[in-house]
């Protein structure tokens, strides 16, 4: 080491480099000091003056130490899309990062250039590799026995709830729906046990595999709003059997309304001497199709006295959507004086036994030609344990409906045009058919 | 059903390589991550890395960075191990699966073994 | 690199008894995005996937078996064990783009 310190400017001994924070000036041929972060060189050094240095600009800065004669300028504003997670100040440069929900598509030296949003997993689909600042999501179908019903860019596939008794299997894309006995839950605490609504949003992935084809059933099992998310069972408290009385009950009531109407109009009745049917249909049938398990049950001329009844049917097949499509078969396809529900059956497990559950609800509505109204609800139900699933029920197994039907006859109407209707459009009116089993 | 199906043992000398095969059948290869993990006699698992076979991307551990190659060929849905500059510590059973925190889909190969011996 | 550890190394139990297996984070606290992970491993059986995600059971394994976690730990508990229960029990923590499995811990009967 040198007996003194040498100042700048200085000439350095040969073969020696300049010291730290020092650089070595080709013009001068001397050790100069340079300039700090946030300065640049405003003058550079001679022989016998060091080099002089002025603070950088706004929008511009430096880093490092030191000898360039204009400060750098910061990088552009970042985007909509970004977020400032360094400001440009005299001695350091704007970063831009993308903000919550994107990655980074195109990297610079220091944060990024192009952010993009991280792909979103649909219905069926689950995050297989979660999104990193530089990576986008990857997402794949849920496995069997999971499923996701969210459109996100976080959430993975989840088990199904484990049922006593399965009312609708979980598939893809939904959990399983228990019967009122409790579940077993596959999940955590605190997680949510009834199928969410789904978006739709569109994906960068495949189609989503076909769901199972249980058809769910219509009104019985209403999926109404979500549970709370905390200690709930994720099932349907009120039994079965209550939900029928109440459905029966309702469409009693709405016939009485019917035939006071119709005897306040001097409607004479046809009073058809036939007997409905309806087979029980293998589930890959019964998926969302209107096939011959729905019968024709109740014909009104079109006047005010069908809007109830119209509008309560309605709102049964609105509560409870099917699996395959946005909403159940419903009165919207039916003419003004029809109202409609579907029957389904549910498909137990492979092998296992099913207990099915045949619930008929008719109303017959009948008014005699003295104007005294004779009102007769008859509900058919059949109940029992079967040792197949629903949708290998005998082909000749039928469900009497109801050994009377009764139509209003309008002025417009003759007893040969509305026998002739019979087998045109398909009227059901809340026939649930459900089959509930155990898992 | 489904079924992962390796390749059978193979011996090797240090500083060889060896590419371990495992035939997934039973569902569509691209649906799921194929993972790669190894057990070294009387010892605890050791993740390789993953492939998503239906783009070929993989994620290796650290360790594996630089000696391992993953790839899938999904035309025969086989998936593919190549572990490069082998070392007496690399003996071990290799295993192939499906089976990660993410998806669910639980299947393993039968494993095969691997041994580095001069 | 991360580390998981897993404790204890064995744990002695009787058929019936609770058994509480951990599995620690080296780098910090385990978060959701660490999908804790823990497979059975029994001898000359293949592996068998029981906890995953966000502590769910995968479909098929019975209720006996639940994961939890808090802090740096990540838990698997068994309420009460049934003589198949009797194995090797492996953690695997999610770390960004990679699986750490943990050291595994030896559940043995008493």
């Known amino acids: 080491l040198p007996a003194q310190v040498a100042f700048t400017p200085y000439a350095p001994e040969p073969g020696s480099t300049c010291r730290l924070r020092e650089y070595y000036d080709q013009t001068a041929q001397m050790c100069c000091s340079k300039c700090s972060p946030g300065q640049h060189a405003k003058v550079f050094c001679t022989k016998t003056s060091d080099t002089v240095c002025d603070s950088c600009e706004d929008s511009t800065y430096t880093q490092l130490w030191n000898w360039v004669p204009e400060c750098l300028s910061c990088g552009s504003r970042c985007s909509s899309d970004q977020v400032e997670t360094q400001a440009c100040t005299r001695e350091q440069n704007r970063i831009c990062t993308c903000r919550p929900g994107w990655y980074c598509a195109l990297s610079k030296q220091e944060g990024c250039r192009l952010c993009a949003p991280l792909r979103k997993c649909r219905p069926g689909f689950g995050v297989a590799r979660p999104g990193t600042e530089t990576s986008d999501v990857v997402c794949k179908p849920c496995a069997p026995g999971t499923f996701s019903n969210t459109t996100s860019s976080t959430d993975i596939c989840r088990p199904h709830q484990i049922c006593n008794v399965v009312a609708i299997p979980g598939n893809a894309s939904m959990d399983a729906v228990c019967t009122s006995t409790s579940p077993t839950r596959s999940m955590a605490p605190g997680a949510v046990h009834l199928p969410q609504p789904v978006s739709t949003r569109s994906q960068h992935t495949q189609p989503t595999p076909e769901p199972s084809t249980a058809p769910s059933t219509s009104f019985l099992l209403p999926m109404g709003p979500s549970p709370p998310a905390e200690g709930s069972t994720g099932d349907f408290a009120l039994p079965v059997g209550l939900i029928v009385g109440v459905t029966a009950l309702g469409l009693l009531i709405i016939g009485v309304v019917n035939c006071v109407i119709m005897t306040q109009v001097k409607k004479k009745p046809l009073c058809l001497q036939r007997e409905a049917k309806v087979p029980h249909l293998p589930a890959d049938k019964a998926r969302g199709t209107q096939g011959p398990e729905q019968q024709h049950l109740l014909i009104t001329a079109p006047s005010s006295s069908s809007s109830s009844l119209e509008s309560s049917a309605s709102a049964l097949d609105r509560r409870a959507p099917t699996r395959n499509q946005p909403q159940a078969p419903g009165v919207e396809a039916s003419g003004a004086g029809e109202a409609r529900a579907s029957t389904g059956s549910s498909d137990s497990s492979p092998g296992g036994h099913g207990t099915q559950v045949n619930v008929t609800c008719i109303v017959n509505v009948c008014s005699s030609s003295d104007h005294s109204s004779q009102c007769s609800s008859q509900a058919s139900s059949t109940m029992g344990d079967t040792d197949s699933s629903p949708s290998e029920s005998p082909k000749d197994e039928q469900v009497p409906f109801s050994k009377e039907e009764c139509a209003f006859r309008s002025q417009l109407e003759t007893p040969e045009t509305l026998l002739g209707s019979t087998e045109e459009k398909p009227l059901p009116l809340g026939v649930p058919d459900a089959g509930m089993k155990p898992s | 059903q489904v079924q992962l199906v390796q390749s059978g043992a193979e011996v090797k000398k240090p500083g060889a390589s060896v590419k371990v095969s495992c035939k997934a059948s039973?569902?569509?290869?691209?649906?799921?991550?194929i993972h790669w993990v190894r057990q070294a006699p009387g010892q605890g698992l050791e993740w390789i890395g993953r492939?998503?076979?239906?783009?070929?991307?993989?994620e290796y551990a650290p360790n594996f960075q630089d000696r391992a190659t993953m790839t899938t060929d999904t035309s025969t849905s086989t998936a593919y191990l190549e572990l490069s500059s082998l070392r007496s510590e690399d003996t071990a059973v290799y295993y192939c699966s499906t089976w990660d925190g993410f998806s669910y889909f639980d299947y393993w190969g039968q494993g095969t073994t691997v041994t580095v011996s001069s | 690199e991360a580390v998981v550890t897993q404790s204890p190394a064995t744990l002695s139990l009787s058929p019936g008894e609770r058994a509480t297996l951990s599995c620690r984070s080296s780098t910090g606290p385990v978060t959701t995005n660490n999908y804790a992970n823990w497979v059975q491993q029994k001898p000359g059986q293949a592996f068998r996937g029981l906890i995953g995600?966000?502590?769910d059971r995968a479909p098929g394994i019975p209720a006996r078996f639940s994961g939890s976690g808090s802090g740096t730990d990540t838990t698997l508990t068994i309420s009460s064990l049934q003589p198949e229960d009797f194995a090797v029990y492996y953690c695997?923590?999610?770390?960004?783009?990679?699986?750490?499995f943990g050291g595994g811990t030896k559940l043995e009967i008493k």
């Open positions: 039973g569902y569509t290869i691209t649906d799921f991550y």
């Open positions: 695997a923590l999610w770390y960004r783009n990679h699986w750490v």
């Open positions: 492939v998503d076979p239906e783009d070929g991307n993989t």
């Open positions: 995600g966000t502590n």
